[in-house]
Every structure is written in C-alpha cells, then in structure tokens.
C-alpha cells in the first residue's frame, strides 16, 4: 500500500478522511490530524508537515488548513453558556441558558430566546432534548392543577382532603387546588381557595 505522498491519476485518494489530493503535483498527501494544521505543504518528495495549534485555537477534523480556528467564548448576549472549554481538537461547547430555547441553528445553536410562559391550568410538554424548541403548553390532566404563569411550573395533583382528615369544601380545577375544611366546621361565605383547619 502506497504511503503519502503518492501519485494519483484519477484525482482520488485511498483514505478520504486522512489524505487529500494536491492538484499542483497530482499527488495524494496526508491531512493533518485534529489539533494540528499544515506548517509545510507536501511536495513529490516530502509529505505534509503538521504543527500543533497554538493556545486558544483548534482544528476539529483531519485537515489541510494552514491555520487553526480561533476559540470563541460562549455569548450570553445570545443566551448561550459554556458546557465544555475549547481544546486544540474541539471548539468551545455551548448550550442555551436555563429557561431558554434555541431560536437559530447553523450547524450549532447560535441564538437562544426565553421560553414562553405556560398560563395557569397548563404546563410545558416535556421534550426529549432541553433547549431544542419553545414551550408547547398542554392542559393539566384530570386531578391536577397549575396556578401560575411560568415557563417551567408543573401541574400538581389536587390535595386529597380525606388524607388529612378533612372534607372537600370546593373541588379543584385545572387552575386551583381542592379547598378542604374541617368536617365539624361550616364553610363561611367568604371562603375561597384556602384550607381551613
């Protein structure tokens, strides 16, 4: 098996990932591994010479680039935060800040926006991946309530009065909990949405 540099008449190389075709000399040369760049181009008698990327720069793939890419901070202005720092082999890994979703995507997320509030009586439908899309609010299922406007509040089960030795004064709704009262006590007319003990 030929070792780079080697002649190629059909302009293709055996290992597309780790080699590239150099049209000037009509040869296949080695690409540089991740974390490095081309410091000297190949010739018919000498293969590519690679050098390590300088601090705060990287190349992620086998490449024949003459420079490394500059590491970039995650940008809070775009609602992004860091999950892994930049290395010579990988760019800074960013994600949406909590309570936000990715609103613009170009190979990676470039802009996050605040999740919409879900109104009382609803909750955000759980997604497979956090931060991938805006909230889709769904009604609380039977026997549950949610009484705030919030992007993250979950529907809670209605209080079961009998579990506390109390009786139901007013049934729960999707937006409010059950109202309980002491079984010996009459319900005053001003009673609304509280628990009497």
């Amino acid at each position: 098996q030929a070792v780079p540099p080697y002649a190629s008449e059909n302009q293709t190389c055996r290992d597309q990932e780790k080699e590239y075709y150099e049209p000037q000399h009509r040869i296949c040369c080695s690409r540089c591994p991740p974390g490095t760049y081309v410091s000297a181009k190949c010739s018919r008698i000498r293969d590519t010479v690679c050098a390590t990327c300088a601090e705060n720069s990287y190349n992620e793939h086998w490449n024949y680039l003459t420079i490394c890419q500059l590491c970039r901070p995650c940008d809070p202005v775009m609602g992004l935060e860091e999950i892994a720092p930049c290395t010579s082999k990988r760019k800074t890994q960013c994600r949406c800040q909590p309570g936000m979703f990715c609103a613009a995507w170009a190979l990676e997320c470039t802009h996050c926006e605040l999740l919409s509030d879900c109104p009382p009586g609803t909750e955000a439908e759980l997604k497979d991946e956090v931060g991938k899309g805006n909230n889709h609010c769904v009604p609380c299922k039977a026997g549950h309530f949610q009484n705030t406007s919030s992007p993250s509040a979950r529907c809670q089960p209605h209080t079961r009065c009998e579990n506390q030795g109390l009786v139901e004064a007013a049934p729960g709704t999707a937006q409010s909990d059950t109202t309980c009262k002491n079984p010996l006590e009459p319900l005053p007319p001003e009673m609304s949405g509280t628990m009497l003990m």
């Epitope: 705060n56 970039r72 901070p73 800040q97 309570g99």
Partner: antibody
Framework: EVQLQQYGAELGKPGTSVKLSCKVS????????IHWVIQRPGKGLEWIGR????????ISTEKFKNKATLTADLSSNTAYMQLSQLKSDDTAIYFC?????????????WGQGTLVTVSS | DIQMTQSPSQLSASVGDRVTLSCKAS??????LNWYQQKLGEAPRLLIY???ILQTGIPSRFSGSGSGTDYTLTISSLQPEDAATYFC????????FGSGTKLEMK
C-alpha cells in the same frame, strides 16, 4: 496580563461624529467579544453593545442602534466605536470591556474609559 | 426586557459595620449575576461573579448570595476603602446593569 488602552478625552461638536478606540494587549481579540458601556455624568452603567471581532457581527441595544457603530481590526488588536449625530446627552464616559474564554460571562478587564464631551 | 433594581440607592455606614446591598431582577435570572465596585474617576472592578464566586484579588470580606430574583452583596466588616458605588449586572439573556448603590462612610 490583559490590558485595554483608551484615549482619555474626545471633544465633538453637535451633529458630528467621533470614533473611539480600544487597544487590547496581552490577549488576542479574536478570542473575545468586545463590549462597550456608557456612563453619563453622575449616573450608572449602561450596556451599549458588543462586536465579534472575527466576523464583525454586532449586537446593540435598540437605543444605540442608530448611534453607535462597532468595528474591530484583528491585525492591530483594536476595537472601535463610532458615535454619530452627536447630541449633548451623548456627553459621557465610554468604557470598553472584553468577555474572554476564561471570563465569558463577566467584565473582568476594563479600559480606563474615554470622556466624550459634546459642545459647540 | 429583564430589569435590575438595586436598593438602597444610597447608604451610609461606619467602619467595621456589616453592610448588605440588594439587587432584584424582574424575573428569574438563575444566579447569573455579577457585582462590580466603582470608585470616583475609575473604571468598574469585578468583585463577584456567578452570584457568589469571589474574583481573584478581592478581599474575603466581600461575599454574594441569592437565587431566583433576589441577590445580595455583603461586606462583613466595612473598611474605609470600600466607599464606592456598587453595581449588580445580570448576564442571563444578555447584559443589564442595576442602577447602583452609593456606599459612603459615616
């Protein structure tokens, strides 16, 4: 050590423009976003906007969209902010501050500020 | 837009006092908060980032706490050189500064 150099003072006439500079040493601005902050006399700090020096992309608050133009020059490691159509209430100190790979969420380094005085 | 409100706007205290400054966000900012100190004629200086992490070189008498919408900067034993204006800054969904608290010595 990261250092930011700004000129101390600029005088501008109403209706004209001034261009402020922020020269960074000790760090490649290609690894930063450069932010600009205004402080009017006796007042608080207000974020104006930021530039990505690698591609020139800028974001600024609505208030400064037609007032401040942000640019950067990687070769001289310098960021610029041009203030146009100067008015008396543009009289203020303007600070530059980078967010870096190690301080992406805070302004750990500041220029000393440029005092812009608008007067006829 | 998320608003940041600081209180009090002015405060007078004596050397050795324990001083507490407040910063309130108009909605949850998930502890994404910094504190800066600014003395007259100087650029601001980062004191605390991410709610409670002391910036390198800052005296340990400064501390930060809080969550959700309410945040606090505490100076455990006030020193004369602490006379300054203090600003909070959120970095959640962009940067916004609070209006500042001016701390004076009695």
């Amino acid at each position: 050590e990261v250092q930011l150099q700004q000129y101390g003072a600029e005088l501008g006439k109403p209706g004209t423009s001034v261009k402020l500079s922020c020269k960074v040493s000790g760090y490649n601005i290609g690894n930063t976003y450069i932010h600009w902050v205004i402080q009017r006399p006796g007042k608080g700090l207000e974020w104006i906007g930021r530039i990505d020096p690698t591609n020139g992309n800028t974001i600024s608050t609505e208030k400064f969209k037609n007032k401040a133009t942000l640019t950067a020059d990687l070769s001289s490691n310098t960021a610029y902010m041009q203030l146009s159509q100067l008015k008396s209430d543009d009289t203020a100190i303007y600070f530059c501050a980078p967010t870096t790979l190690t301080t992406p969420d805070s302004f750990a380094y500041w220029g000393q500020g440029t005092l812009v005085t608008v007067s006829s | 837009d998320i608003q940041m409100t600081q209180s009090p706007s002015q405060l007078s205290a004596s050397v050795g006092d324990r001083v507490t400054l407040s910063c309130k966000a108009s909605q949850n900012i998930y502890k994404y908060l910094n504190w800066y100190q600014q003395k007259l004629g100087e650029a601001p200086r980062l004191l605390i980032y991410s709610t409670n992490i002391l910036q390198t070189g800052i005296p340990s008498r400064f501390s930060g706490s809080g969550s959700g919408t309410d945040y606090t900067l505490t100076i455990s034993s006030l020193q004369p050189e602490d006379a300054a204006t203090y600003f909070c800054q959120k970095y959640y969904s962009g940067f916004t500064f609070g209006s500042g608290t001016k701390l004076e010595m009695k």
